[in-house]
């Protein structure tokens, strides 16, 4: 018979014949032959493979390094990787949560638009005209300038995105 050019699902083509893939949690030891089945072996402790595969080495479980602010959210199995997350008060530094850092602060002139969570950093926004922030903070929003008029005062010094206005008494003409 003609050798196959394509194989069924969960099979792979090698040496002009279709061999069974190894199931999740197992690695390939030897390809099948005309007379023998594919030989697979279970992944060792702290290893995994999450798909039907022909890998000769299992993948290492991710290590949730406490020195990087990480802790185990879900322990790995022979078929799944360990899932890490950040300690309280820290957030992931990337999509795969490879490590964690303390939440970013918004510099003076910027306010917090969105407070950080375990998976996302602080989002800062520039203080618009009429608002200011004079501190570096991970939770403070931009504050509105003081309204001198409501205090029956006048603006003596204009505000900026980093400083509040300075109010002073109105100059009154003497009789």
């Amino acid at each position: 018979p003609e050798p196959p050019t394509a194989c069924r699902e969960k099979q792979y083509l090698i040496n002009s014949q279709c061999c069974s893939l190894c199931q999740p949690g197992q690695k390939l030891v030897s390809d099948c032959t005309e007379f023998t089945e594919t030989e697979c072996l279970p992944c060792g402790e702290s290893e995994f493979l999450d798909t039907w595969n022909r890998e000769t080495h299992c993948h290492q479980h991710k290590y949730c390094d406490p020195n990087l602010g990480l802790r185990v959210q879900q322990k790995g199995t022979s078929e799944t990787d360990t899932i890490c997350t950040c300690e309280e008060g820290w957030h992931c530094t990337s999509e795969a949560c490879e490590s964690c850092v303390l939440h970013r602060s918004c510099s003076p002139g910027f306010g917090v638009k969105q407070i950080a969570t375990g998976v996302s950093d602080t989002i800062c926004e520039p203080c618009p005209v009429g608002f200011f922030s004079n501190v570096s903070s991970a939770f403070e929003k931009c504050h509105p300038w003081t309204s001198c008029e409501t205090k029956d005062l006048v603006v003596q010094q204009a505000g900026t995105n980093k400083t509040d206005v300075v109010c002073g008494p109105q100059d009154r003409l003497r009789a």
Epitope: D81, T93, A96, E98, V101, S120, S136
Partner: antibody
């Protein structure tokens, strides 16, 4: 063994697309971010972009219009495509595991842009 | 992108010297900063991340400090194998549309 290996043509013509592949072993691409970095001869490191463990892509502002990073988890490969290349794109191109904490690097591959 | 300004660009020193390299970020990146060592013809090697945490197998003469926008790498007593180029790298990440990343320009540590 945990390792990375870049591969691709060492010579690319101006205005063509540079295509590189990074083949990984010993860890799962779905669990790590992968970055591409380049280094022009005699110069410093330049971040090109990254692909997250969940598939999100992140590009340096200079690269946004020209770069595509993709991943094929079944082949354990991450690819980089850089279009409309010029002589200024001549560099050693590295793939690395991670985002800021780049704890594992390939040996790098030199790509020369020349006609 | 995040701009990281490294200084000095070049540094001549002798074995046993204490060496300090600084890295300034254009915006607050918390402690999300790494330091790398690179030797000619080789890929960079991770020394420190985040900011002050030594990577596995890195000698204790290396130390890092700083947070926010100002960071420092110190080699307490320079050894012959430490003559190399050092890079800082840092950034932040919130989502695909809100992130920053970059490398410093490098500091070449040469033999005096």
């Amino acid at each position: 063994e945990v390792q990375l290996q870049e591969s691709g043509p060492g010579l690319v013509k101006p205005s063509d697309t540079l295509s590189l592949t990074c083949t990984v072993s010993g860890f799962s691409l779905s669990s790590y971010d992968m970055s591409w970095i380049r280094q022009p001869p005699g110069k410093g490191l330049e971040w090109i972009g990254a692909i997250g463990g969940a598939g999100g892509t992140y590009y340096a502002s200079w690269a946004k219009s020209r770069v595509t990073i993709s991943v094929d988890t079944s082949l354990n490969q991450v690819s980089l495509k850089l279009s409309s290349v010029t002589a200024a794109d001549t560099a050693v191109y590295y793939c690395a595991r991670g985002w800021t904490r780049l704890d594992l690097w390939g040996q790098g591959t030199l790509v020369t842009v020349s006609s | 992108d995040i701009q990281l300004t490294q200084s000095p660009s070049f540094l001549s020193a002798s074995v046993g010297d204490r060496v300090t390299i600084t890295c300034q970020a254009s915006e607050d990146i918390s402690s999300n900063l790494a330091w790398y060592q690179q030797k000619p013809g080789k890929p960079p090697k991770l020394l420190i991340f985040p900011a002050s945490n030594l990577a596995s197998g890195v000698p204790s003469r290396f130390s890092g400090s700083g947070s926010g926008t100002e960071f420092t790498l110190t080699i307490s007593s320079l050894q012959p194998e430490d003559f190399a180029t050092y890079y800082c790298q840092g950034g932040y990440w919130t989502s695909t549309s809100n992130f920053g990343q970059g490398f410093g320009g490098g500091t070449k540590v040469e033999i005096k």
